[in-house]
């Protein structure tokens, strides 16, 4: 969490941003809040990006003002216009690109003063893994697949019964480049698994960590997966 204050002495307002990550090809949110003003016409929101000449986005007098918007963001940005009045200056970024990564500044002007805060935005690819029993294999084998990751992640297997065990010798992981030549499909196979045990396939890069669990018993198979972004720090 980054909290910024205005630089004009007593005429300052608090602006808060949260570092976040964008998933390439999907829509992302750059989070920013501020002390709300009472009337929409007095609120100006400017989003800027380090190293970019034009504005990322500008909202003033109750509507978008995009005449100074940089070409790389044309048609891809929007604020939540209905939420500006209660202090939400967050920016929606459509079709996130690798090149969108960087330092952004959320700059706010209201009748109470000015304020700004920076936000670190990482971009990459991350997806939920799915773990299945591989019935085609000669021995009891689990197969963990996740369709889109970038940068290349690490994959680690764990088991509830054999806690702390190193499965690197009995697993094999491959990374297959997807058609857009950036993201990769992750496939990891774990051999010699035993029933009545829960196995976890953990995929992690510097942006996200995802886990796929599978519990195999004589009578049923239970699956669960979750994904966590690693860098949600507020400013």
């Amino acid at each position: 969490l980054i909290i910024g204050f205005g630089i004009s002495g007593r005429h300052s307002i608090t602006v808060t941003t949260v570092a976040s990550a964008g998933n390439i090809g999907e829509d992302g949110i750059l989070s920013c809040t501020f002390e709300p003003d009472i009337k929409l016409s007095d609120i100006v929101i400017q989003w800027l990006k380090e190293g970019v000449l034009g504005l990322v986005h500008e909202f003033k007098e109750g509507k978008d003002e995009l005449s100074e918007q940089d070409e790389m963001f044309r048609g891809r940005t929007a604020v939540f216009a209905d939420q500006v009045i209660v202090g939400n200056a967050s920016l929606r970024l459509k079709n996130v690109q690798l090149t969108d990564a960087g330092t952004y500044k959320c700059y706010i002007i209201t009748s109470k003063g000015k304020g700004n805060a920076n936000l670190e935005y990482k971009t990459g690819a991350f997806s939920m893994p799915e773990v299945n029993v591989d019935y085609n294999a000669s021995s009891e084998t689990l197969r963990c697949e996740a369709p889109r990751w970038f940068p290349q992640p690490t994959v680690v297997w764990a088991s509830q019964v054999d806690q702390g065990a190193n499965f690197s010798e009995v697993s094999n992981t491959s990374f297959e480049l997807n058609s857009e030549n950036v993201t990769m499909k992750v496939v990891s196979v774990l051999y010699n698994v035993t029933i009545n045990n829960t196995y976890s396939c953990m995929i992690e890069n510097d942006i996200a960590k995802a886990t796929g669990d599978i519990k195999v018993t004589e009578s049923e198979i239970k699956r669960r997966s979750h994904l966590q972004l690693l860098n949600s720090k507020a400013s």
Epitope: P36, K39, G62, V86
Partner: antibody, heavy 117, light 107 residues
Framework: EVQLQQSGTVLARPGASVKMSCKAS????????MHWIKQRPGQGLEWIGA????????KYNQKFKDKAKLTAVTSASTAYMELSSLTNEDSAVYYC??????????WGQGTSVTVSS | DIVMTQSHKFMSTSVGDRVSITCKAS??????VAWYQQKPGQSPKLLIY???YRYTGVPDRFTGSGSGTEFTFTISSVQAEDLAVYYC?????????FGAGTKLELK
């Protein structure tokens, strides 16, 4: 659950002053504007002004600048409005209303003020 | 001050009817308009904000539209519980101002 609890009915003499309260619960009191609205019997709604409890910033409708004084005590999550030099024209129901999610989305039940000699 | 004019003080309707209430601003208020419902003896309730966004829990028979100076609030199929006074409000500039209200009553 967001709630705004207003003080009870007031009967006052012309020329007197009254102070009414609005106790907020269920949200961060210091982060949102608290507005005050006047409604005379059978009439429409008039915006008196608003206070931002986080820093006591106030905005007034010029019409009520000399009539109403808005204050807030953050430790008690309570906003106050004092009306001075009362006349019959001040007989009305006064609402406090906050902008927690959006424009005036939570309202108190109203405080009825009757000015009579 | 911006004047919000609701052209009808009263509107007669029947259950199941579609009804539209108009509100005209004396100057451009972009989309910073809200609509409230008030029943006798009750506090007003927010129905629509930012011209067309339905507030949480508001049935989808209530809609809003417009921008600039002309705004419309519509109930697609009036229910008995919708009989009330409806107010428009601008929050583009202070002082925040309301329309005089339109009372929806049964024919």
């Amino acid at each position: 659950e967001v709630q705004l609890q207003q003080s009870g009915t007031v009967l006052a003499r012309p020329g007197a002053s009254v102070k009414m309260s609005c106790k907020a619960s269920g949200y961060t009191f210091t982060s949102y504007w608290m507005h005050w609205i006047k409604q005379r019997p059978g009439q429409g709604l008039e915006w008196i002004g608003a206070i931002y409890p986080g820093n006591s910033d106030t905005k007034y409708n010029q019409k009520f600048k000399d009539k109403a004084k808005l204050t807030a005590v953050t430790s008690a999550s309570t906003a106050y409005m004092e009306l001075s030099s009362l006349t019959n024209e001040d007989s009305a129901v006064y609402y406090c209303t906050s902008t927690v999610r959006n424009v005036m989305d939570y309202w108190g039940q109203g405080t009825s003020v009757t000015v009579s000699s | 001050d911006i004047v919000m004019t609701q052209s009808h003080k009263f509107m007669s309707t029947s259950v199941g009817d579609r009804v539209s209430i108009t509100c005209k601003a004396s100057q451009d208020v972009r989309t910073a308009v809200a609509w409230y419902q008030q029943k006798p003896g009750q506090s007003p309730k927010l129905l629509i904000y930012s011209t067309s966004y339905r507030y949480t829990g508001v049935p989808d028979r209530f809609t809003g539209s417009g921008s600039g100076t002309e705004f419309t609030f519509t109930i697609s199929s009036v229910q008995a519980e919708d009989l009330a006074v409806y107010y428009c409000q601008q929050y583009y500039v202070t002082p925040l101002t309301f329309g005089a209200g339109t009372k929806l009553e049964l024919k």
